[in-house]
């Protein structure tokens, strides 16, 4: 018995060939001996089967002794043994129809689980072999689960359903809803304007939800909500904002926040959460602000940084075009009785400068000038 695998929703063509290369009488029946279709001369006749409106043949092939049964919009329950009766012969074809679908939704939040469910006919014992967009293989039976979805799992998942060394292939497009970056750090000199950007890693026709930025300042004992906003069809509207600092928010995507001035009291880390309509769970992006201040008080030149810095970062004070006078893995460095000239305070990571602030030291009888 020939076995043919089909895909739910697709069209399948079951072949039946006579030894005579001419149009002769044929019938297709199901396992219950109910006629599906056949011919009367050059006319196609249909029987009382459930396939009535979805069954067809190719009249153009009859003259060549080919009498196919075409079933459109396949359903799992179309799985059956189909019998072609032609020239006093019976040709049997077993059709097995499979479906593979993603759980509830193909748009999932980062960190959520993806479950692919296989619909299969009774008595079959298929296995499913799937490959993620980044090329990772996963095998399963009736269900196949992937926990903790990552951004790289967005895209086309390709799956092969195997049954008795035969296969049917599926593609499922998955969108992982996430911010492009899980975390970002902004380095600013005191007084500079700060721009925070939260680009999304996906595009959808309509995007509706609400969000909030919570901020934990390094100097503060507890976190506070800096801003809450709504998102409606990709349009942003601010609901509530603190008075200090007075953040401004862009009206369009990507989500964009402006802090008028970087001040030591704002240095710290924030967590922007975005709750999307009809989705359980939230998207998160961490944002960090590091603020630098260089000051001269009497005979002491000081450079300080506030905010979440890694222990491997180096803070240095140097006179322009000279070797660093002081360089430490600390958050404050100073030089006593600095020479006159342009001093640079540098925050660097393995030689790469992340933040720089210049301060001009005048001869001792003058007061300092900050450019």
């Amino acid at each position: 018995k020939k076995v043919v695998l089909g895909k739910k929703g697709d069209t399948v063509e079951l072949t039946c060939t006579a030894s005579q290369k001419k149009s002769i009488q044929f019938h297709w029946k199901n396992s219950n001996q109910i006629k599906i279709l056949g011919n009367q001369g050059s006319f196609l006749t249909k029987g009382p089967s459930k396939l009535n409106d979805r069954a067809d043949s190719r009249r153009s092939l009859w003259d060549q002794g080919n009498f196919p049964l075409i079933i459109k919009n396949l359903k799992i329950e179309d799985s059956d043994t189909y019998i072609c009766e032609v020239e006093d012969q019976k040709e049997e074809v077993q059709l097995l129809v499979f479906g593979l679908t993603a759980n509830s939704d193909t748009h999932l939040l980062q960190g959520q689980s993806l479950t692919l469910t296989l619909e299969s006919p009774p008595g079959s014992s298929p296995s499913v072999q799937c490959r993620s967009p980044r090329g990772k293989n996963i095998q399963g039976g009736k269900t196949l689960s992937v926990s903790q979805l990552e951004l790289q799992d967005s895209g086309t998942w390709t799956c092969t359903v195997l049954q008795n060394q035969k296969k049917v292939e599926f593609k499922i497009d998955i969108v992982v809803l996430a911010f492009q970056k899980a975390s970002s750090i902004v380095y600013k000199k005191e007084g500079e304007q700060v721009e925070f950007s939260f680009p999304l890693a996906f595009t959808v026709e309509k995007l509706t939800g609400s969000g909030e930025l919570w901020w934990q300042a390094e100097r503060a004992s507890s976190s506070k909500s800096w801003i809450t906003f709504d998102l409606k069809n990709k349009e942003v509207s601010v609901k509530r904002v603190t008075q200090d600092p007075k953040l401004q928010m862009g009206k369009k995507l990507p989500l964009h926040l402006t802090l008028p001035q970087a001040l030591p009291q704002y240095a710290g880390s924030g967590n922007l959460t975005l709750a999307l309509e009809a989705k359980t769970g939230k998207l998160h992006q961490e944002v960090n602000l590091v603020v630098m201040r260089a000051t001269q008080l009497q005979k002491n030149l000081t450079c300080e940084v506030w905010g979440p810095t890694s222990p491997k970062l180096m803070l240095s004070l140097k006179l322009e075009n000279k070797e660093a006078k002081v360089s430490k893995r600390e958050k404050a460095v100073w030089v006593l009785n600095p020479e006159a000239g342009m001093w640079q305070c540098l925050l660097s990571d393995s030689g790469q400068v992340l933040l720089e602030s210049n301060i001009k030291v005048l001869p001792t009888w003058s007061t300092p000038v900050q450019p």
Epitope: Q129, R131, P133, N137, G155, T158, T160
Partner: antibody, heavy 118, light 106 residues
Framework: EVQLEESGPSLVKPSQTLSLTCSVT????????WNWIRKFPGHKLEFLGY???????NYNPSLKSRISITRDTSKNQFDLQLKSVTTEDTATYYC????????????WGQGISVTVSS | DIYVTQTTSSLSASLGDRVTIICRAS??????LNWYQLKPDGTLKLLIY???RLHSGVPSRFGGSGSGTEYSLTISNLEQEDVATYFC????????FGAGTKLELK
Amino acid sequence: EVQLEESGPSLVKPSQTLSLTCSVTGDSITSSYWNWIRKFPGHKLEFLGYISFADTTNYNPSLKSRISITRDTSKNQFDLQLKSVTTEDTATYYCARDDFGYYAMDYWGQGISVTVSS
Amino acid sequence: DIYVTQTTSSLSASLGDRVTIICRASQDINNYLNWYQLKPDGTLKLLIYYTSRLHSGVPSRFGGSGSGTEYSLTISNLEQEDVATYFCQQGNTLPTFGAGTKLELK
């Protein structure tokens, strides 16, 4: 029977683009996964990338900036392009089919020897 | 990246011998381990896929086993035509190959 055959130039100059074609008979490239692998003079094998039945591609991360695999379903062929080649790309290049998605290459071409030299 | 290591680069055996080639992966590869035969003329053939499944047309003297990070290929009754280089390859993620084991006759 499934057969694969590689074709293309056997000599490529450094900095140029290596272009190879794999012609498939006995199976349709709109089914299965179609791979490129190379074998270096010392017999070391390296996976380059694949193109799937769904027309999705995946490449060896070490080659990502230089590699492209495309297909022509009307000719039942798939191609490999490797840009900015160096002498290190001298190898025998194979195309192969992975029928069931296990990265198990069940049919291979005979291989084409490519030398990168000026 | 997942690395696969074939500890033996070459081995000699006599006709009729039972030969085992070992392959280790740098992490659990969930049985996605395939074995290939490379003949001196450059022909590559799949022998075993998914740890232990024999590819069609491959003689039953070839067998595969293993799990987690350790896998093996066994030739139960060595024949002249089995003289070749054998490669393991992981298929849990983008494929990587072992360095190969050259099998020669004593």
